[in-house]
Amino acid sequence: YDFTNCDFEKIKAAYLSTISKDLITYMSGTKSTEFNNTVSCSNRPHCLTEIQSLTFNPTAGCASLAKEMFAMKTKAALAIWCPGYSETQINATQAMKKRRKRKVTTNKCLEQVSQLQGLWRRFNRPLLKQQ
């Protein structure tokens, strides 16, 4: 999906009102020095691409993020503020239902959510002049 035509300000508002707090809750008890961000993004569409990938694609050691509250709210925000996003996700959602697993918070998941927080920070405040 090409995130170029999303309403970035509305997505930012959704993130700051609820998603950010859910991420903080998920990370509660984790030391702020524990994880170094290794995933980066250069502009808002790129940030959303990386955010989508880390939030919804199962990875080795962390298969369960898509069921978390922050993930569901992220999906809702993208569905509302990115034209045509919902349609592209129907097949992915059906595939995910087949893979449904018990929710387990692993260290790998904590690391992944720390990466997500970093990506959202760059989405909210891209360093490039083209904001």
Epitope: E9, A13, Y15, L16, S20, I24, S32, T33, E34, F35, N36, N37, S40, S114, Q117, G118, W120, R121, R122, F123, N124, R125, L127, K129, Q131
Partner: antibody
Framework: EVQLVQSGAEVKKPGSSVKVSCKAS????????IEWVRQAPGQGLEWIGV????????NYNENFKGRATLTADKSTSTAYMELSSLRSEDTAVYYC????????????WGQGTTVTVSS | SIVMTQTPLSLSVTPGQPASISCKAS??????VTWYLQKPGQSPQLLIY???NHYTGVPDRFSGSGSGTDFTLKISRVEAEDVGVYYC?????????FGQGTKLEIK
């Protein structure tokens, strides 16, 4: 506990350069932007620029472009702001600050470094 | 650059009374406004981010509102510890810019 500790006061001659350091602790240094802001005596706040310590990306206020250089050393968790071609109007307190967890504000500030430019 | 204009530049308030500071942007900054307080002899400290969100530990007597070009910081009941200079800041466009500051004194 997050802390930003800046280097001590400096007295410089016009035309010279100054390099202010900002040592971060209590968080993953590479993960958060470091901002630089200055405040002339009795004046308001003026943004100088920002650096991403993770990759060295920077963005400068045009008013300081060519004179200010922001760098970061990940091995020591220290950010630096160098200002060249100093003039008397550069006399100010220079602050480093960290972006907050959402990327929309500066949540931790250094104690400030006084730079005096005088002949 | 986006110019942030604060009014008033100073105000004197009796403890327990409300106070209000206005910040106007020269062009729309969406909701990308932050408020800081600089107490005498200290570094600035974060109060409110993204127009109306309280930073951790900030008393709820502080509140922020507005969008687009007009923003307001309100203190419902001023206390002696609230003295200092209040700054609004926009982070919608580079360069980031601050208002001139509003000095709050206690009567």
């Amino acid at each position: 506990e997050v802390q930003l500790v800046q280097s001590g006061a400096e007295v410089k001659k016009p035309g010279s350069s100054v390099k202010v350091s900002c040592k971060a602790s209590g968080y993953a240094f590479s993960n958060y932007l470091i901002e630089w802001v200055r405040q002339a005596p009795g004046q308001g706040l003026e943004w100088i620029g920002v650096i991403d310590p993770g990759n060295g990306d920077t963005n400068y206020n045009e008013n300081f472009k060519g004179r200010a250089t922001l760098t970061a050393d990940k091995s020591t968790s220290t950010a630096y702001m160098e200002l060249s071609s100093l003039r008397s109007e550069d006399t100010a307190v220079y602050y480093c600050a960290r972006e907050d967890n959402t990327g929309t504000a500066f949540d931790y500030w250094g104690q400030g470094t006084t730079v005096t430019v005088s002949s | 650059s986006i110019v942030m204009t604060q009014t008033p530049l100073s105000l004197s308030v009796t403890p327990g009374q409300p106070a209000s500071i206005s910040c106007k942007a020269s062009q729309s900054v969406s909701s990308d406004v932050t408020w800081y307080l600089q107490k005498p002899g200290q570094s600035p400290q974060l109060l409110i981010y993204y127009v109306s969100n309280h930073y951790t530990g900030v008393p709820d007597r502080f509140s922020g509102s507005g969008s687009g070009t007009d923003f307001t910081l309100k203190i419902s009941r001023v206390e002696a510890e609230d003295v200092g200079v209040y700054y609004c800041q926009q982070h919608h466009r580079f360069p980031l810019t601050f208002g001139q500051g509003t000095k709050l004194e206690i009567k």
